[in-house]
Interface confidence: medium
């Protein structure tokens, strides 16, 4: 009984290391936390959701996905740079300063992920359009949910 | 292109009463939060109050709270601040504000008065 418990856990872990090798290094642990903080952040809207952000969806067509996911990590970046002191989002409850203090460590999270798929050091972003945080994110949501339905089919 | 245009400032008593109004076009002013920004005689711009497009959340300055109340209608596209009890040190250019980027885009402003 002990050493059944005692195996069960490397044997769980072995197994899912399988499927992900069966299913190719692309649908890795990376792109299922992006997609986990993705559903966390599109849940609940903040006093600063609303801001809005350079929208690089717009035009992204001859847009590499590194690229895309560099210059969608630059945007949060830029986002949370700016807006993580704004006394706006930080509200006068503490219930909006919790929300809000939990919406800058979700992004940074996201952040650190995004770089980590793209694996490139800088890309720019030069778009005109705007988009709001919330519409954004639903965006990337997508983006990330079709790629993830391709890598693990 | 966006147009935020305030009205409803003037010369005010203390302890009296003012509704500021915000009519914005050029933007789907229903997905946008919004606000207002005030700026004292030399002085630096303070935000005031803010609320989400639903109108569900609010933020007020510490200053202003339980005097100052931030609504909006959807339908008319405008932005309202009803200011109650007001002080001399509210005397300010009350600006209506959107969010653009790491930018806010505002108004020409309104003028609001306190004084005896």
């Known amino acids: 009984m002990g050493l059944t418990s005692q195996l069960l856990p490397p044997l769980f872990f072995l197994l899912a290391c399988a499927g992900n090798f069966v299913h190719g290094h692309k649908c890795d642990i990376t792109l299922q936390e992006i997609i986990k903080t993705l559903n966390s952040l599109t849940e609940q809207k903040t006093l600063c959701t609303e801001l809005t952000v350079t929208d690089i969806f717009a035009a992204s067509k001859n847009t590499t996905e590194k690229e895309t996911f560099c210059r969608a990590a630059t945007v949060l970046r830029q986002f949370y740079s700016h807006h993580e002191k704004d006394t706006r989002c930080l509200g006068a409850t503490a219930q909006q300063f919790h929300r809000h203090k939990q919406l800058i460590r979700f992004l940074k999270r996201l952040d650190r992920n995004l770089w980590g798929l793209a694996g490139l050091n800088s890309c720019p972003v030069k778009e005109a359009n705007q988009s709001t945080l919330e519409n954004f994110l639903e965006r990337l949501k997508t983006i990330m949910r079709e790629k993830y339905s391709k890598c693990s089919s | 292109e966006v147009q935020l245009l305030e009205s409803g400032g003037g010369l005010v008593q203390p302890g009296g009463s003012l509704r500021l109004s915000c009519a914005a076009s050029?933007?789907?002013?229903?997905?946008?939060?919004m606000g207002w920004v005030r700026q004292a005689p030399g002085k630096g711009l303070e935000w005031v109050s803010w609320?989400?497009?639903?109108?569900?959340?609010?933020y007020y300055a510490d200053s202003v709270k339980g005097r100052f109340t931030i609504s909006r209608d959807n339908s008319k596209n405008t932005l309202y601040l009803q200011m109650n009890s007001l002080r001399a040190e509210d005397t300010a250019v009350y600006y209506c504000?959107?969010?653009?980027?790491?930018?806010?885009?505002w108004g020409q402003g309104t003028l609001v008065t306190v004084s005896s």
């Open positions: 504000a959107k969010s653009l980027g790491r930018f806010d885009y």
């Open positions: 050029g933007f789907t002013f229903r997905n946008f939060g």
């Open positions: 609320i989400i497009s639903s109108g569900t959340e609010t």
